[in-house]
């Protein structure tokens, strides 16, 4: 098809070799008169169009993406040739940065339903450059975590070294939808909820004497639980005595609940106390038996091949520890009567 009628947008992706960046292109279709596919509410020139832009389409994935080879060859279907580029609904997602991503990307509806739709396409000229200036060594990460229940902020990586005062107007999107009230280089979140998680895109315009282009960065935002303030608690054994049969094998299980910690180094071990002596026992490896966002339950067993008289005089102690502190639970064996 003839792409000369496509509306054109220029974008710049400046990536750092130190960060784990991705990139997205939205299929930003224009609004030719009478086109049902590219239909959206009429906007005044000052308004920014809202994404996702397919208000008239029943199926948001009803768009085709192409790359225009620089040598003038026919347009290539993105899905067939580029494994590091994936299409998610009407968004093109680049999983790895690199100058080889530079080029022209065209999107248009899959179904051409009227003559007006022929020109219903967008050509995005993407320039990809590695970051050269080392002036901003500590720019914001392209993956940012917010702690649930606390205040937080999401920074635009390409502008995070600039003060709010000198920052240009920024257009923010979350999961492809325009966040119309956000215009600064940082989104401040008063209280973090699960719904703040998502893929955020920050755009700003850069110009020179010849032309202007959109500088874009993508931020993956995750909402996570804050570190626990509690030491682990032992769920089992509950009782401090255990009835046993002499000469029989015995397994005592220690189950402990550890609260979430970003740097998680749980300790769970068994040791034996016999009068003034105590020593750690070599036991099977600990295993995680339940893992949730807030905590993890870990189990470690002590195995006695057969219970002896000597074992009845000993205390078997389960010791658990995290970065906050430790807890112990001791078990005394008692011979079963009758």
């Amino acid at each position: 098809f003839n792409i000369s009628g496509c509306s054109t947008k220029k974008l710049l992706w400046t990536y750092s070799t130190r960060s784990e960046e991705e990139f997205v292109l939205f299929c930003d279709l224009p609004e030719p008169q009478k086109s049902h596919f590219c239909h959206r509410n009429r906007l005044s020139p000052k308004q920014v169009p809202e994404h996702l832009p397919f208000m008239g389409s029943n199926d948001l994935s009803d768009v085709q993406w192409y790359q225009q080879p620089s040598n003038g060859d026919p347009l290539e279907d993105i899905r067939k040739s580029y494994p590091h580029i994936i299409q998610d609904k009407c968004t093109l997602h680049f999983l790895t940065p690199g100058v080889n991503n530079s080029g022209s990307y065209i999107c248009r509806p899959k179904m051409i339903k009227s003559p007006y739709d022929v020109a219903c396409c967008v050509k995005m000229i993407l320039e990809v450059k590695p970051q050269t200036n080392a002036s901003c060594e500590y720019s914001a990460s392209h993956k940012q975590d917010l702690l649930l229940g606390s205040t937080g902020s999401i920074s635009c990586p390409s502008l995070s070294c600039q003060s709010d005062a000198q920052s240009p107007a920024v257009t923010w999107y979350k999961n492809g939808k325009l966040l119309s009230v956000e215009r600064s280089n940082r989104i401040v979140v008063d209280e973090v909820y699960d719904y703040h998680q998502g893929t955020y895109v920050c755009d700003y315009t850069q110009s020179d004497t010849v032309s202007s282009w959109t500088v874009r960065a993508v931020v993956q935002v995750r909402t996570i639980v804050g570190d626990t303030k509690l030491k682990p608690d032992i769920l089992d054994p509950v009782e401090d005595t255990l009835e046993v049969e002499l000469g029989k094998p015995l397994t005592i299980s220690c189950k402990a609940r550890f609260g979430f910690e970003r740097v998680f180094n749980p300790v769970i071990k068994w040791y034996i106390k016999d009068s003034d002596l105590e020593w750690e026992v070599s036991v099977p490896e600990a295993k995680s038996i339940k893992s949730t966002l807030k905590d993890e339950i870990i189990e470690r067993n002590i195995i006695l091949e057969k219970v002896t008289q000597r074992d009845l005089r000993r205390k078997f102690v389960c010791f658990v520890q995290n970065s906050i502190g430790n807890t112990t639970q001791s078990v005394q064996l008692k011979e079963k009567r009758g």
């Epitope: 070799t17 998680q197 909402t223 996570i224 966002l293």
Partner: antibody, heavy 115, light 112 residues
Framework: SLEESGGRLVTPGGSLTLTCTVS????????MAWVRQAPGKGLEYIGV?????SAYYASWAKGRFTISKTSTTVDLKITSPTTEDTATYFC?????????????WGPGTLVTVSL | DIVMTQTPASVEAAVGGTVTIKCQAS??????LAWYQQKPGQPPKLLIY???ILESGVPSRFKGSGSGTEFTLTISDLECADAATYYC??????????????FGGGTEVVVK
């Protein structure tokens, strides 16, 4: 391709450096990882060195291992190995850029820590 | 750190059958999950990345799904060659709060 070397029998407390030699791979374009596997056990992630030369480690591996690179090699230094460090050590190349899915692996080199 | 819990530890199924392996992350990792296959004496082989994208050359009998904290690998029309240990891996990477990469404990698939 990737090939690990330097695996040997070492006594606890000694120092050991493993080398991953790459061919046909531009190390400025890929994150490189070290992963180990104790005999009969699962895969254990140690850490990576990214395209810009920054190293990141699993929390248990911090201070015990150091990853560095040249234009054609990626090194893993094991400081004060213990018997628990006995394993096959693999180096792996990321899918591209600073990613953590690894689509090219070396055959591995065996490190045995024993008295 | 992130804890990846894989279940079951071992599963047996007949040729032509279907196997489902589950992987749970201790915190959300969106779609940053990979699946690997490892046969004895060999390094792991990447099967799926980004939770559901099939690596080039991997048969479509392998299917990855899930997002957030719960993920599944389904192998249908089992073949003898599928007998191996399968690992999930969190590939989230580095954020402002830490470094999140790690493997599940593995699932041994035995084909009868």
């Amino acid at each position: 391709s990737l090939e690990e070397s330097g695996g040997r029998l070492v006594t606890p407390g000694g120092s050991l450096t493993l080398t991953c030699t790459v061919s046909g791979i531009d190390l400025s374009s890929y994150t490189m990882a070290w992963v180990r596997q104790a005999p009969g056990k699962g895969l254990e992630y140690i850490g990576v060195i990214n395209t810009g030369g920054s190293a990141y480690y699993a929390s248990w591996a911090k201070g015990r291992f150091t990853i560095s690179k040249t234009s054609t090699t990626v090194d893993l230094k094991i400081t004060s190995p213990t018997t628990e460090d006995t394993a096959t050590y693999f180096c792996a190349r990321s899918y591209g850029g600073n990613r953590y899915d690894f689509n090219i692996w070396g055959p591995g080199t065996l490190v045995t820590v024993s008295l | 750190d992130i804890v990846m819990t894989q279940t079951p530890a071992s599963v047996e199924a007949a040729v032509g059958g279907t196997v489902t392996i589950k992987c749970q992350a201790s915190q959300t990792i969106t779609s940053y999950l990979a699946w690997y296959q490892q046969k004895p004496g060999q390094p792991p082989k990447l099967l799926i990345y980004r939770a559901s994208i099939l690596e080039s050359g991997v048969p479509s009998r392998f299917k990855g799904s899930g997002s957030g904290t719960e993920f599944t690998l389904t192998i249908s029309d089992l073949e003898c060659a599928d007998a191996a240990t399968y690992y999930c891996q969190c590939t989230y990477g580095t954020t402002n709060t830490g470094h999140y990469v790690g493997f599940g404990g593995g699932t041994e698939v035995v084909v009868k």
